[in-house]
């Protein structure tokens, strides 16, 4: 069965300077491949976080993603700024062999509204 990526919140509002959690769960870890968060769509989309060991300032995972059966890929964004506003997508990839990883499923997106303090 095809993996499903669920982002339960269509939108979240957060005051500038505060933190917010963007929720994402998957129904399967197969086919093997990373999960990444992006802001925006298409050619201009921006990589926000990747669950592949790199460090991303202000962003961290919420659950224990080193669990071998972890299905929760939610993230916490700290010290939110107005520039963080936009729609965030949780995306499951299938690892490529000699080619880049292939996107196989995306969540429906969560729009982040940043409120002035």
């Amino acid at each position: 069965t095809e993996v499903k990526v669920t982002q339960p919140e269509k939108s979240v509002s957060v005051a500038a300077g505060d933190s917010t959690i963007l929720n994402c769960t998957v129904t399967s870890l197969l086919p093997v491949g990373p999960i990444r968060w992006y802001r925006g769509v298409g050619q201009s989309r921006l990589l926000i976080y990747s669950f592949t060991g790199e460090h991303f300032p202000r962003i961290r995972n919420v659950s224990d993603t080193t669990k071998r059966n972890n299905m929760d890929f939610s993230i916490r964004i700290s010290n939110v700024t107005p520039e963080d506003a936009g729609t965030y997508y949780c995306v499951k990839f299938q690892r490529g062999s000699s080619e880049p990883d292939t996107e196989i499923q995306s969540g429906g997106g969560t729009e982040v509204y940043v409120l002035a303090k």
């Epitope: 197969l30 093997v32 990373p34 592949t52 080193t66 669990k67 071998r68 059966n69 690892r95 062999s97």
Partner: antibody, heavy 117, light 108 residues
Framework: DVQLVESGGGVVRPGESLRLSCAVS????????MSWVRQAPGKGLEWVSG???????YYVDSVKGRFTISRDNSKNTLYLQVNSLTAEDTAIYYC???????????WGLGTLVTVSS | SYELTQPPSVSVSPGQTARITCSGG??????YAWYQQKPGQAPVTVIH???KRPSDIPERFSGSSSGTTVTLTISGVQAEDEADYYC???????????FGGGTKLTVL
Amino acid sequence: DVQLVESGGGVVRPGESLRLSCAVSGFRFSSYAMSWVRQAPGKGLEWVSGISSGGDTYYVDSVKGRFTISRDNSKNTLYLQVNSLTAEDTAIYYCARETWNHLFDYWGLGTLVTVSS
Amino acid sequence: SYELTQPPSVSVSPGQTARITCSGGDYYSTYYAWYQQKPGQAPVTVIHSDDKRPSDIPERFSGSSSGTTVTLTISGVQAEDEADYYCGGYDGRTYINTFGGGTKLTVL
């Protein structure tokens, strides 16, 4: 520099127990899953057990119920309690740091466990 | 579970290219790595995540995959590359790590 230093090996009789330790430095231990891998004399590598950063545990079938992996994130130390030892458990036991997808990137030098009557 | 199969030995002359294969995993559910072990020493990771080389590993080491076979390629083999090489796999279906039997690389 990443360092993994095992200790606690020795010569024991069948049925006896040992506690192996792996002291780590050079990285944020609490963020990584860890594993124990063993190598019998003149043989290949065998994965024994793994533990997530939060303490979820995994074992190869042959050691389930006899071996217990644990960690103390405050002491930067990984443990393997080995009980009811048999001659087949004679091996060098290595601790290894896991990558995001549960392969291994850094290894300790190993500690030798010899089970002999 | 699954078994990873490697050739017991591979021989190559210095400066030539060595290829060590590993088969038996399920590409849908398995990630691969290659580990080098010299006599009396601990293993060293030369490739992980199919084709990722740690920063301290020479560029002559590379990994690739095709179907259910993964390959470690050592270009311009040097005498110091003589060692046992183990293919390792992590199966996301069973949550288990497996190793191949090892391949002894001899530099003639």
